[in-house]
């Protein structure tokens, strides 16, 4: 519009006039007037400030605390705050990733459908017709059942979702 | 101290372009639209458009469309001036200038309060 | 465009004498004014926004006044360094255009 109907994108409006806000980094010391600039100062060690600010201090840095099972993914600098993550075998309770939890396990019966990361669980599914699992895992699929086909074998035991089938040799005495 | 620290002068023949800087310190660069202003040999002011150094948006005066183009460099606070098909009357010297608003009665009123000192280009076969 | 006239456009005057130039705009511009001073070889400086408001660090012997289309620039005391060329430049339309000036010069 013209001309102007607010202050421009990367300004405040303070005692009558339009000032600079301080850039990502920085933190506001004081404000612009008639006679001076906006004055403004780095962030200091292990703080920062992500967007264009009048902020008078700067945001601490997030602390990756291992008693929680959390670990740094990303240094944080002075325009962006830290990314934690979990320890091998965790992930985060939650999208900030303030604490971890022990990846969870598919019982027997179920599969791995995706493995677990750092940010989110394992993901089970039951194992179809024709697939087993037979152990509690976070890594392991279900597995196909044996073909006893393939083997020159016959079923003796059927399979269960748990359970592989059990093949045994053919009866000879059929014709 | 704000100060706005132009390239020197030039000569060019009819027909090139020019491309005239403006390096600004003493203030956040990208906190203030730039803008280009001329002034022919004896001649009055005659403004050619503007840049918002943030996003490196411009908006060029109607008589200057096709012909201007203004450009920024933020990482080293420099805004940027090209005119190209040079005629003899470009001849002029060229300006940049800062955009202060100032706020009263409801209204928000800008002006130029901090100029370059200015980049003669001739124009001339 | 908005046509910006200044009157007089050649003013010779003396040290000490009250000086008052005359800017008029095509078209209403409320109080979207200003008044530059330019000497010669040098960048235009602001003295004057908002048609009235005085620029930091300009003398107290400049004012401003008007608004719509009749606008005045005063010096009540003119000193030796007030001799120069005066602008008006209207910021409300695009382009924002300046008037085509008023030289000062010592009679």
């Known amino acids: 519009p013209e001309p102007p109907t607010a202050c421009r994108e990367k300004q405040y409006l303070i005692n009558s006039q339009c000032c600079s806000l301080c850039q990502p980094g920085q933190k506001l010391v004081s404000d612009c007037t008639e006679f001076t600039e906006t004055e403004c100062l780095p962030c200091g060690e292990s703080e920062f400030l992500d967007t264009w600010n009048r902020e008078t201090h700067c945001h601490q840095h997030k602390y990756c605390d291992p008693n929680l099972g959390l670990r740094v993914q990303q240094k944080g600098t002075s325009e962006t705050d830290t990314i934690c993550t979990c320890e091998e075998g965790w992930h985060c309770t939650s999208e900030a990733c303030e604490s971890c939890v022990l990846h969870r396990s598919c019982s027997p019966g179920f599969g791995v459908k995706q493995i677990a990361t750092g940010v989110s669980d394992t993901i089970c599914e039951p194992c179809p017709v024709g697939f087993f699992s037979n152990v509690s895992s976070a890594f392991e699929k279900c597995h196909p059942w044996t073909s006893c086909e393939t083997k020159d074998l016959v079923v003796q035991q059927a399979g269960t979702n748990k359970t592989d089938v059990v093949c045994g040799p053919q009866d000879r005495l059929r014709a | 101290q704000v100060q706005l620290v132009q390239s020197g002068a030039e000569v060019k023949k009819p027909g090139a372009s020019v491309k005239v800087s403006c390096k600004a310190s003493g203030y956040t660069f990208a906190g203030y639209y730039m803008y280009w202003v001329r002034q022919a040999p004896g001649q009055g002011l005659e403004w050619m458009g503007w840049i918002n150094p943030d996003s490196g948006a411009p908006t060029y005066a109607q008589k200057f469309q096709g012909r201007v183009t203004m450009t920024r460099d933020t990482s080293i606070s420099t805004a940027y001036m090209e005119l190209s098909r040079l005629r003899s009357d470009d001849t002029a010297v060229y300006y940049c200038?800062?955009?202060?608003?100032?706020?009263?009665?409801?209204?928000?009123?800008?002006?130029?309060?901090?100029w370059g000192q200015g980049t003669l280009v001739t124009v001339s076969s | 465009d908005i046509q910006l006239t200044q009157s007089p456009s050649f003013l010779s005057a003396s040290v000490g004498d009250r000086v008052t130039i005359t800017c008029r705009a095509s078209q209403g511009i409320s109080s979207y004014l200003a008044w530059y001073q330019q000497k010669p070889g040098k960048a235009p400086k602001l003295l004057i926004y908002a048609a009235s408001t005085l620029q930091s660090g300009v003398p107290s012997r400049f004012s401003g006044s008007g608004s719509g289309t009749e606008f005045t620039l005063t010096i009540s005391s003119l000193q030796p360094e007030d001799f120069a060329t005066y602008y008006c430049q209207q910021l409300i339309s695009y382009p924002w255009t300046f008037g085509q000036g008023t030289k000062v010069e010592i009679k």
């Open positions: 200038a800062r955009e202060k608003i100032y706020y009263g009665s409801g209204n928000y009123y800008p002006s130029f309060d901090y």
